[in-house]
């Protein structure tokens, strides 16, 4: 069998809401993956599991099941959303993210994703990790950078 390639493209959008009383931030982060099937037979994408970390703490997890079938020598782009919560011992971030005197409220998040594919009864797991900037101060749609090695997110104006 030839390789199945998983490429984490980046954050597509981040939608933020706040609970002032609990000093909690809710970030719905939509990410984009490219999955390429280099084989001459179809491959099933069984599931995608993802988690997001902030300051070494897991702030969100998501799992997608029975996602899609990728045909021979084909590629599919898949978006998945991870709901995240920044609260409790990180409640100081509420002060940061809602402080309007700061124009861009970029925080560094670690995106981790594992894709499980299956073909001929055989399962394979491919994982990726990437640090990304996300603005916790406003809803943002990002232009996905194409570079494999550098993913600089620029908020659309």
């Amino acid at each position: 069998p030839r390789s199945i390639e998983v490429k984490y493209i980046g954050v597509k959008s981040a939608y933020v809401s706040y609970d002032a009383e609990k000093r909690t931030i809710y970030l719905n982060i939509t990410n984009t993956l490219n999955i390429t099937n280099n084989n001459y037979y179809s491959v099933e994408v069984e599931n995608i599991t993802a988690q997001v970390q902030f300051s070494k703490t897991v702030i969100g997890k998501a799992r997608l099941n029975n996602i899609t079938n990728i045909g021979p020598l084909d590629m599919k782009q898949i978006d998945y959303t991870v709901p995240t919560v920044i609260a409790e011992e990180m409640s100081y971030m509420y002060d940061f993210c809602t402080l309007l005197s700061i124009k861009v409220h970029n925080i560094v998040l670690m995106m981790q994703v594992t894709v499980t594919t299956a073909y001929f009864g055989h399962s394979e797991q491919i994982s990726q990790e990437r640090y990304q900037y996300v603005d916790c101060g406003r809803n943002t749609t990002y232009q996905l950078a194409q570079s494999e090695y550098l993913n600089v997110l620029q908020p659309q104006q």
């Epitope: 706040y18 100081y92 509420y94 993210c97």
Partner: antibody, heavy 117, light 112 residues
Framework: EVQLVESGGGLVKPGGSLKLSCAAS????????MSWVRETPEKRLEWVAF????????YYADNVKDRFTISRDNAKNNLYLQMRHLKSEDTAMYYC??????????WGQGTLVTVSV | DIVMTQAAFSNPVTLGTSASISCRSS???????????LFWYLQKPGQSPQLLIY???NLASGVPDRFSSSGSGTDFTLRISRVEAEDVGVYYC?????????FGGGTKLEIK
Amino acid sequence: EVQLVESGGGLVKPGGSLKLSCAASGFTFSNYAMSWVRETPEKRLEWVAFISDGGGYIYYADNVKDRFTISRDNAKNNLYLQMRHLKSEDTAMYYCARDGGTGFTYWGQGTLVTVSV
Amino acid sequence: DIVMTQAAFSNPVTLGTSASISCRSSKSLLHSNGITYLFWYLQKPGQSPQLLIYQMSNLASGVPDRFSSSGSGTDFTLRISRVEAEDVGVYYCVQNLELPYTFGGGTKLEIK
């Protein structure tokens, strides 16, 4: 317990200089923006200056711009306000305050600055 | 600059009864993120100001629930449900929507 302790106030002649300090403890200083706020003899509160957690954003009230400089030393948990070309209208009690989206959550006890001949 | 307007004195209030303090801003303090950037502080005699209410309606840590606040984008009211002697002082409203942050002139709570 969060504590902010100001120092450096005193009596100074018009045109003179003073440097105020604010020692922070009881919280992770480098996580928070800080502001200086002053209380005039007429008991009015005026925001003076702002500095973001990492010092990347700095703002001043128009009446102190080009005369006052706010700075911070996150390694020492200290906030500063360098005041130059002082005027009589700068006479006030100066407070440092922890700043953020939830307001000035903590204030120091204040340090009095008197500008007089 | 945003102008914050307060009456200098409240109506004299009897201990144990309720009191209201008003504040008006020259511009709506409701941001597009859904937060209203209006804050209330109390300065007791001889003390530093202390935060009472953040983001228009949220009680700051350690503040008794006798205090509450409500408002629209420009008109705000601080309510004290059962006034106690320790509530005496000057109440300031502040906007943090735009720089420069601006304070109201303060309202002195008067006890009968």
